[in-house]
Amino acid sequence: MMTGTIETTGNISAEKGGSIILQCHLSSTTAQVTQVNWEQQDQLLAICNADLGWHISPSFKDRVAPGPGLGLTLQSLTVNDTGEYFCIYHTYPDGTYTGRIFLEVLESSVAEHGARFQIPHHHHHH
């Protein structure tokens, strides 16, 4: 039975040209995290493998940086970066936990971080 929950940075906003940290945290489970994938729609941004480290997809290498921790830093933001981002935790033996972050990239300097909130797991694959 999957008992874990993923806490994310939730709904966040940032300024065009700036950078933002996407962060997720898996708790309430003793499952071993084997890999974390960061995704946007059907695009794979990055993989953090527990043994092998980070792989940033070549499409994003210029403006995505690994970390901090299992998080991901997006740089040189554009308005086109607005949208949903997902952290996919591959774990053993639980399966897959998914967290969602919505990023809004703003033209002006009114960007501010949304509150953190918890998302219970809602995807499960073996």
Epitope: N37, E39, L44, I47, L52, W54, H55, S57, S59, H90
Partner: antibody
Framework: EVQLQESGPGLVKPSETLSLTCAVS????????WNWIRQPPGKKLEWMGY???????YYNPSLKSRITISRDTSKNQFSLKLSSVTAADTAVYYC??????????????WGQGTTVTVSS | DIVMTQSPDSLAVSLGERATINCKAS??????VAWYQQKPGQSPKLMIY???YRYTGVPDRFSGSGSGTDFTLTISSLQAEDVAVYYC?????????FGGGTKVEIK
């Protein structure tokens, strides 16, 4: 240039342990990921597992109870042991390097492969 | 495990013509797909990674496309040296898995 060379017996009896070694030249096995991949006759390539730059291992769950991958950094080589073999383990066995940082799980260097037959 | 299914099993194409190989994943693997070429008696060679990026030294007549579950390897103008078996592989999650291969021959 990275070169990998498999060695080991070409014939193994059923229920015994298959042992292969991969000698690596032109690159240190304390970097990147070092893999074993096999191809049974007329079947798909099957990724068996890896040993990482730090010595951590990951095994395909289908083989987990039978497989061991180890390394000897002083000789710059890594090894495969597969226990309790059956005819289904007859295959060409490849050792391979994977540069995860640049190519993810895509394998960029392969050995030439060695054929292992399981038969009494 | 994620199953990678290739089609067709074999393909005969005239020299200079286009060859198209398909690969379907049993679940969404985003762009975590590689393609390999294996000539008779040789080990596989990496051709494409991250679905569409050519590996070092791969001729530009080879291209990869797709995301999600459907992927394609295209040889825009088949050359005699392209006769081989081509395999797709997913590395979205372990265990990394391969397709069954597509044999490309000269018509």
């Amino acid at each position: 240039e990275v070169q990998l060379q498999e060695s080991g017996p070409g014939l193994v009896k059923p229920s015994e342990t298959l042992s292969l070694t991969c000698a690596v030249s032109g690159y240190s096995i304390t970097s990147d990921s070092w893999n074993w991949i096999r191809q049974p006759p007329g079947k798909k390539l099957e990724w068996m597992g890896y040993i990482s730059y730090s010595g951590n291992t990951y095994y395909n769950p289908s083989l987990k109870s039978r497989i061991t991958i180890s390394r000897d950094t002083s000789k710059n080589q890594f090894s495969l042991k597969l226990s309790s073999v059956t005819a289904a383990d007859t295959a060409v066995y490849y050792c391979a390097r994977l540069d995860f940082s640049n190519y993810g799980g895509a394998v960029d260097y392969w050995g030439q492969g060695t054929t292992v037959t399981v038969s009494s | 495990d994620i199953v990678m299914t290739q089609s067709p099993d074999s393909l005969a194409v005239s020299l200079g013509e286009r060859a198209t190989i398909n690969c379907k994943a049993s679940q969404n693997v985003r762009t975590a797909v590689a393609w390999y070429q294996q000539k008779p008696g040789q080990s596989p060679k990496l051709m494409i990674y991250s679905a569409s990026y050519r590996y070092t030294g791969v001729p530009d007549r080879f291209s990869g496309s797709g995301s999600g579950t459907d992927f394609t390897l295209t040889i825009s103008s088949l050359q005699a040296e392209d006769v081989a078996v081509y395999y797709c592989q997913q590395y979205y999650t372990t265990p990394w898995t391969f397709g069954g291969g597509t044999k490309v021959e000269i018509k």
